[in-house]
């Protein structure tokens, strides 16, 4: 088992909004749960966009999940990762 490296980034979206993207990379096996939480509970699926789980060329895999949020509310969102029984949560950078 190779645990993922998880990285959260933010980018400008429409006025007053930002897109936050959570990327998991260099993990094996390919089964992974990656999702955004808002206020500590699941963020509805229709407000998230997922990338495919793709090989990254090193025998491991990568994927991502993104959502659009209001600027100033970043604290309310965390990216949750589960892989091979390991869990971690990742905040949006300031």
């Amino acid at each position: 088992t190779v645990p993922p490296m998880v990285n959260v980034t933010r980018s400008e979206a429409s006025e007053g909004n930002i897109t936050v993207t959570c990327r998991a990379s260099s993990f094996y096996p390919r089964n992974i749960a990656l999702t955004w939480r808002q206020d500590g509970v699941s963020l509805s699926h229709d407000t998230q966009q997922w990338g495919d789980v793709l090989p990254d060329g090193n025998g491991t895999y990568q994927t991502w999940v993104a959502t659009r949020i209001c600027r100033g509310e970043e604290q309310r969102f965390t990216c949750y990762m589960e892989h091979s029984g390991n869990h971690s949560t990742h905040p949006v950078p300031s």
């Epitope: 939480r37 500590g40 604290q75 965390t78 589960e82 949560t89």
Partner: antibody, heavy 119, light 107 residues
Framework: DVQLQESGPGLVKPSQSLSLTCTVT?????????WNWIRQFPRNKLEWMGY???????NYNPSLKSRISITRDTSKNQFFLQLISVTTEDTATYYC????????????WGQGTLVTVSA | DIQMTQSPASLSASVGETVTITCRAS??????LAWYQQKQGKSPQLLVY???MLADGVPSRFSASGSGTQYSLKINSLQPEDFGSYYC?????????FGAGTKVEIK
Amino acid sequence: DVQLQESGPGLVKPSQSLSLTCTVTGYSITSDYAWNWIRQFPRNKLEWMGYINYSGTTNYNPSLKSRISITRDTSKNQFFLQLISVTTEDTATYYCSYYRYDGAWFPYWGQGTLVTVSA
Amino acid sequence: DIQMTQSPASLSASVGETVTITCRASGNIHNYLAWYQQKQGKSPQLLVYNAIMLADGVPSRFSASGSGTQYSLKINSLQPEDFGSYYCQHFWSFPLTFGAGTKVEIK
């Protein structure tokens, strides 16, 4: 360490309002987290009532929405529960707690305060 | 609302025994589950979060598992301090709801 302490009257008459205070020490309620009220009925059933978060946003249990209000006094680092039009069914031990945004579980609770609704 | 059904409602066990408590959700909660222990006259204490993760300071005789709608809490070699009530709580969506509890008593 975050510490929470509930206070308020132990006896409330039916049809009146129940008002409780949670005093938080060791952490500023405006820094982060969701600050919650949870109650436990005499037969031990637990009910999440609602929260006010670090920015003042509230979220209530729909079963209580018409009767509940959670507010705060940031200068005293306190948050409050008001429940109007109480009945004997609101007799319970009331707890304040908080959760972090990595997940809505409750790592620490106040010691609880028993409120009896009776004429 | 997601309803949480715990079983059994109570059980009697001896020190050293293994006990298992189960919690069923009325919908898939995707491991968004916590477990608490409550002693008589005290506040609940967090035992488990994210369905399987032990909270800080929780002894390793406690373990938790499950997925989808079915979850369980197992206590290996029950100790005198383990007697009390246990509650599950989901945090998949609002409103957050708890199970009705399982009371673990001394046989």
